[in-house]
Interface confidence: medium
Amino acid sequence: LEVQVPEDPVVALVGTDATLRCSFSPEPGFSLAQLNLIWQLTDTKQLVHSFTEGRDQGSAYANRTALFLDLLAQGNASLRLQRVRVADEGSFTCFVSIRDFGSAAVSLQVAAPYSKPSMTLEPNKDLRPGDTVTITCSSYRGYPEAEVFWQDGQGAPLTGNVTTSQMANEQGLFDVHSVLRVVLGANGTYSCLVRNPVLQQDAHGSITITPQRSPTGAVEVQVPEDPVVALVGTDATLRCSFSPEPGFSLAQLNLIWQLTDTKQLVHSFTEGRDQGSAYANRTALFLDLLAQGNASLRLQRVRVADEGSFTCFVSIRDFGSAAVSLQVAAPYSKPSMTLEPNKDLRPGDTVTITCSSYRGYPEAEVFWQDGQGAPLTGNVTTSQMANEQGLFDVHSVLRVVLGANGTYSCLVRNPVLQQDAHGSVTITGQPMTFPPEA
């Protein structure tokens, strides 16, 4: 019995559903009562899902698998794996037995896009040409491990004093921190590129340093000029710093973080102690760094509703304040493509192609292209619906008259993460069914 599976690994984004395709050719008169179908992990032989004695025996794999029962009789033995995790990566074997027996293994490659890198500079005050600084490029919650490249403002590689560490969290996703130690010139741009080798996704950040003396006078409060970009569910640091004078003690410090627009109190440090979070118990100060002038705020488990401007007020003898913007983001899933009608297609038929991508933020930009990269802007309807967490599901529908053959591709862009997710469908001129049979 010939069992067919894809040669290439199935790539699935963490948190999305994956289909492990497997098919066989049923003979005339075949009935499901004759079928024994077993999915198992190739290496450990752990049972994943089975269909025997004419019925679905269900999932033996964390209740996250399902068969396409209505398609089994046509020879479609594919397995749907829901809410993919890093731990799912590996090889799955599809065993099919009717009278004869056959099996084949399909690989699942799990992936997660890296966030747009955040760049930090240490020290970040009173910088002069010739000073040695440490620039840290941090990108979060990606998989598999990233490749990191540094460049200067003219594209020249900076490979000298670079240390890159990658730490997996409890879900197996990596946070990458790459540290470049460099001697400042008169001015310079330092850029870090974080590549996901499976998704071939590049995320990059850069920082431009112009050494100069800081002005004197009132307390100078420094925050990043660019918005802090934080992925939903991760922790964000809203950086804020001041320059303590010699002899400064925390008893002199009044530090208040508040929402810029509503003036709602977020966190405070007064009378020599941390007054705690006034913002859903999700904020914290870096108390051990306060005396050195680090007034940054840690915001935990970021939500869409946290997006906006936060003001950092610092009062010692003098007073100063500055506002930092928090931009919340979530990557869009790889689009799934559906075609209607999807059988017996011929040139001249009008079809509706739907491109769906899930749980991203902010709203996506959607672009359609043909197989030569030419935009398809004609009959396109795109809808974006926010769920209860404020994350968007995007559905873009292209209505098109089929030519002799053609590729229709949809690109879903997250404008904040500069993350592109794309899907495509190729329709040939012969009468055909979509998706093509394995």
Epitope: G155, A156, T159, A186, H204
Partner: antibody, heavy 121, light 106 residues
Framework: EVQLVQSGAEVKKPGSSVKVSCKAS????????IHWVRQAPGQGLEWMGY????????DYNQKFKDRVTITADKSTSTAYMELSSLRSEDTAVYYC??????????????WGQGTTVTVSS | DIQLTQSPSFLSASVGDRVTITCRAS?????MNWYQQKPGKAPKLLIY???NLASGVPSRFSGSGSGTEFTLTISSLQPEDFATYYC?????????FGQGTKLEIK
Amino acid sequence: EVQLVQSGAEVKKPGSSVKVSCKASGYSFTSYTIHWVRQAPGQGLEWMGYINPNSRNTDYNQKFKDRVTITADKSTSTAYMELSSLRSEDTAVYYCARYSGSTPYWYFDVWGQGTTVTVSS
Amino acid sequence: DIQLTQSPSFLSASVGDRVTITCRASSSVSYMNWYQQKPGKAPKLLIYATSNLASGVPSRFSGSGSGTEFTLTISSLQPEDFATYYCQQWSSNPLTFGQGTKLEIK
């Protein structure tokens, strides 16, 4: 039109030096780095080094570090490459090229026409 | 140094053929550029950042790859495509080119 125009062919004796010029026009000379690449007869391309005309920072291929000097004159939008202690294996066509693009993707988009340097006793 | 090894070094093909040139890096690079050179002329940019077509380059040229393996594909050879092709990286010093692939008429 963006152009890099190089000086003419040179014939030199072993042990001497050669200085090749590369005049830029049609763009802001200080906005891009100028690189020098050479190609020996029937061989591939070999990078020698570059200069940032704005900061005058240079970086060289270690292979040539002790023999090559790249300079730039902002007032005339001209870059120069001087190679000293010439030997017969330095016989090659020498190209200047502009390294263009933007972070993080860069490439040589404009090349000079090439200068043939022949080293022969 | 990162060595770039192109294969094949020589390739004979006919007009209309689909050809693929591979460039392998001795360690991972951030992206690859590709150039075309004709005898007596300076190189010309074809593909930048692995897969982006340079301005004015016909769409029959395409690039792909990541990490250590990159490819340049010409989908249907035209008479003017017979030339030498070079890959180039600058992820670490020194900037390096592949040794070249000479594409000749069969």
